[in-house]
């Protein structure tokens, strides 16, 4: 039987799981307050890898520490458009293999859509997400997510896959996002950024997190991964932010330590089993959810995301450790690794909680709150 | 469906040499790394080398000098030429493919192909 996580499980790395409500829905701006590019550019749209920076050009800055207390919206910058400094970017030179349009990278060329032409789909991802546009959808209950504490035997594997950090998850890892809704974790991975850049894929009002981590999930209707490419809910992936805190996350310190020995690409280590759950928010019943695309090439539609409400917190030194350790193809850092916002072309965002809900005094007029479209209401 | 086909084994006179070849096919293949692996009888499968797309080249100490791995990424094929082959190189020979496909690598495995080092 599947339960869904406590509210009172312990907090990761000793009390640093992350705010209850960083993207807390008090005293929000209203729509005319906070203009944005509506579309950002595609991956086609990007400069080439001449006219981005490279690590050179970096500060050296570390990150700023949130202040303490709840993180509000009213707080983050309301436009970062994608072509800003913060613009994903590969640092990495041509592969010897120049002309080959087959591979992908971030920034540059070849453009996304030759690769695969699904990333020039209408309902790509990531996305923006404005918690006043959601959806408040009862009928979205607490995530259920049963086997992700892993003995330490047997190990498994991480590996520099030249695009991320990957760690491959055994058999026996089961999510449930409601009745009916199953699916088996395969791997996971992060996004992050450079020294004083942030780097996560998906964004709040505009604010792009120090990075992101991506539990990829099959649905059980499929038995292998390349059958569910572009069937609706044939995969889903839990999304969650991570922050600077305080402390050290001691469930990220078992894998941030072991980056070192696969700073080169194409490199492994097998690193004993952990508490997958506790690499991810203690609030498994606060979330939002919409259906998009793989984030990577061959960006494959159909997929539910569910991206968490609380964060997760990391010390500066281990968000460093990410953002600074590993290596990608042709003596590049591995940086910078995510994907511009994409439109989300009509599609309306889901909230499992009343995210839109806006109890300011400031507000002129009444919120304007899209219906809930989820089945089952 | 994505396809893996091994081909070049065979028996072979010690101090000689095979080429291996795998040939991947299926629709629209996004192939990050590729490697070989073995398994010799009553033993655990082993690497022998890898390749990522940008070219760069992993051995296991046992056959450094004697093997080289290679990769043609316009044909999606994975080589491996074995030289000064030795009767410990005795082993069913496996093609891996680590397939970009979910956001990150997927394994998949060829059938695998027997190389028999005897005089």
């Known amino acids: 039987q599947r339960l869904p996580r406590m509210q009172e499980d312990s907090p990761l790395g000793g009390g640093s799981s992350g705010e209850d409500d960083p993207l807390g829905e008090e005293d929000l701006p209203s729509e005319e307050d906070s203009p944005r590019e509506e579309d950002p550019p595609g991956e086609e749209d990007l400069p080439g890898e001449e006219d981005l920076p490279g690590e050179e050009d970096l500060p050296e800055v570390k990150p700023k520490s949130e202040e303490e207390g709840s993180l509000k919206l009213e707080d983050l910058p309301t436009v970062e458009a994608p072509g800003d400094p913060q613009e994903p970017q590969n640092n990495a030179h041509r592969d010897k293999e120049g002309d080959d349009q087959s591979h992908w990278r971030y920034g540059g060329d070849p453009p996304w859509p030759r690769v695969s032409p699904a990333c020039a789909g209408r309902f790509q991802s990531p996305v923006d997400i404005r918690p006043q546009l959601a959806a408040f959808c009862p009928a979205l209950r607490p995530l259920e997510l049963l086997g992700f504490q892993l003995p330490p035997l047997p190990e498994l594997r991480l590996r520099n896959n030249g695009h991320s950090v990957q760690l491959t998850l055994p058999p026996g890892l089961e999510m449930a996002l409601g009745p009916g809704r199953e699916y088996r974790a395969l791997q996971l991975h992060l996004h992050w950024g450079a020294a004083g850049r942030p780097g996560s894929e998906h964004t709040v009002e505009g604010h792009r997190f120090p990075a992101e981590i991506h539990v990829v999930h099959l649905s059980t209707a499929f038995a292998r991964v390349d059958e569910a490419l572009g069937r609706p809910g044939g995969l889903a992936v839990l999304a969650a932010f991570l922050e600077e805190g305080p402390e050290e996350n001691s469930a990220y310190e078992q894998l941030l330590s072991r980056l070192e020995e696969i700073a080169e690409e194409g490199s492994e280590t097998q690193v004993p089993g952990l508490d997958i759950s506790a690499l991810l928010p203690s609030d498994f019943s606060r979330y939002f959810q919409y259906e998009g695309s793989l984030t990577t090439p061959p960006c494959a539609q159909g997929v539910i995301w569910t991206v968490f409400n609380q964060t997760v917190m990391l010390s500066a030194k281990q968000l460093h450790t990410l953002s600074d350790t590993l290596w990608g193809p042709g003596d590049s850092r591995l940086q910078l690794n995510f994907r511009a916002t994409q439109p989300l072309n009509g599609r309306v965002i889901e909230a499992s909680f009343p995210a839109g809900v806006d109890s300011s005094p400031r507000a002129a007029e009444p919120v304007q709150l899209n219906s809930c479209l989820a089945a089952g209401d | 469906q994505v396809q893996l086909v091994e081909s070049g084994g065979g028996l072979v006179q010690p101090g000689g040499s095979l080429r291996l070849s795998c040939a991947a096919s299926?629709?629209?293949?996004?192939?990050?790394?590729m490697g070989w692996y073995r398994q010799a009888p009553g033993k655990q499968r082993e690497l022998v080398a890898t390749?990522?797309?940008?070219?760069?080249?992993n051995y296991a100490d046992s056959v450094k000098g004697r093997f080289t791995i290679s990769r043609d990424n316009s044909k999606n094929t994975l080589y491996l030429q074995m030289n000064s082959l030795r009767a410990e190189d005795t082993a069913v020979y496996y093609c891996n493919v680590a397939l970009w496909i979910a956001d990150g690598e997927y394994d998949y495995w060829g059938q695998g192909t027997l190389v028999t080092v005897s005089s």
């Open positions: 299926g629709s629209a293949l996004i192939i990050n790394a």
């Open positions: 390749v990522t797309r940008s070219g760069r080249t």
